[in-house]
Interface confidence: medium
């Protein structure tokens, strides 16, 4: 694993360029956004200190037939080397605790930029 | 304090152009999403447009009566916030008003156009 | 291109409650905001995310939505609530604003 601040990600560390098209393409899908993203589906929560890419993707990997993440869903699956299945990261799990998609594409949101500006992927 | 002042405005003939500034100070710029509203004399406000931050891509929109003859772009390093206006016509004269659209959408929330700045009138006239 | 429309004006008598609607297509999907405007000055921000209420905005201020009709509600309006309100949302895309044609509110 390449650890970075925290958050692990199995791999070579995304390009910058890459990581700047997938922020903007969360906020794409969460502006201004107040109905409830891919029909209210939930997600397992994870630890985004010590997940990463593959975790994340594991995790939007139970939600399907929701056009409005797919996008998101090919971008993180561009930063993970190998195939991910359903339920592969489970010990990353918090506490079998699930949340809305919209609320976890706004925590990863929140924590690429925070790694972005810290300079985690310059 | 977050504070934001708009100058530049002045009589321009039809088919002349102007630009605006928006000097920011009291919070960081650089997070801020920032838009461009204008108010034509006795008139409702108009959106006119729209620029994100660089960290969120950058992206800028404009509403489709200024599209093409408006620019909007930003200088983080000097704090200040652009409307370059070309082609103007008659109908663009109103005072114009940059605004904060996302003070605190970094970290995840959303005020709407929560600061203003005091508007700059641009007169569009022969 | 997408609209909000607000009724041009409205009129209530101190004490009295004001309601001012905004309706547009994409209320359902997206939030609206309150401007309100007093003459000569910049518009100041009294509700956002169709509910809540910035620090410094009077409790009298609230906003509700449903389906495509967002609501500000002044309770027990006062003369210095006199003043035009903008609603303002964004298009289905989320990536163009707009304004409604404001609503003149008059406390008599």
């Known amino acids: 694993l390449t650890c970075l601040g925290g958050f692990a990600s199995p791999g070579p560390v995304p390009p910058s360029t890459a990581l700047r098209e997938l922020i903007e393409e969360l906020v794409n899908i969460t502006q201004n956004q107040k109905a409830p993203l891919c029909n209210g589906s939930m997600v397992w929560s994870i630890n985004l200190t010590a997940g990463g890419f593959c975790v994340a993707l594991d995790s939007l990997t139970n939600v399907s037939g929701c056009s409005a993440i797919e996008k998101t869903q090919r971008m993180l699956s561009g930063f993970c080397p190998h195939k991910v299945s359903a339920g592969q990261f489970s010990s990353l799990h918090v506490r079998d605790t699930k949340i809305e998609v919209a609320q976890f594409v706004k925590d990863l949101l929140l924590h690429l930029k925070k790694l972005f500006r810290e300079g985690q992927f310059n | 304090e977050v504070q934001l002042v708009e100058s530049g405005g002045g009589l321009v003939k039809p088919g002349g152009s102007l630009r605006l500034s928006c000097a920011a100070s009291?919070?960081?710029?650089?997070?801020?999403?920032m838009s461009w509203v204008r108010q034509a004399p006795g008139k409702g406000l108009e959106w006119v447009g729209r620029?994100?931050?660089?960290?969120?891509?950058?992206?800028?929109n404009y509403a489709a009566p200024v599209k093409g003859r408006f620019t909007i772009s930003r200088d983080d390093s000097k704090n200040t916030l652009y409307l370059q206006m070309n082609s103007l016509k008659t109908e663009d004269t109103a005072v114009y008003y940059c605004?904060?659209?996302?003070?605190?959408?970094?970290?995840?929330?959303?005020?709407?156009?929560?600061?203003w700045g005091q508007g700059t009138l641009v007169t569009v006239s022969s | 291109s997408y609209e909000l429309t607000q009724p041009p004006s409205v009129s209530v008598s101190p004490g009295q409650t004001a309601r001012i609607t905004c309706s547009g297509d994409?209320?359902?999907?997206?939030?609206a905001y309150w401007y309100q405007q007093k003459s000569g000055q910049a518009p100041v921000l009294v509700i956002y995310?169709?509910?809540k209420r910035p620090s410094g905005i009077p409790e009298r201020f609230s906003g509700s939505s449903s389906g495509t009709m967002a609501t500000l509600t002044i309770s027990g309006a006062q003369v210095e609530d006199e003043a035009d309100y903008y609603c303002?949302?964004?298009?289905?895309?989320?990536?163009?604003?707009?304004f409604g044609g404001g609503t003149k509110l008059t406390v008599l």
């Open positions: 009291g919070f960081t710029f650089s997070n801020a999403w």
């Open positions: 995310e169709d509910t």
């Open positions: 303002y949302s964004t298009d289905s895309s989320g990536n163009h604003g707009v």
């Open positions: 605004a904060t659209d996302q003070v605190g959408a970094y970290y995840g929330d959303y005020y709407g156009m929560d600061v």
């Open positions: 994409a209320l359902p999907e997206k939030y």
């Open positions: 620029i994100r931050s660089k960290i969120d891509g950058g992206t800028i």
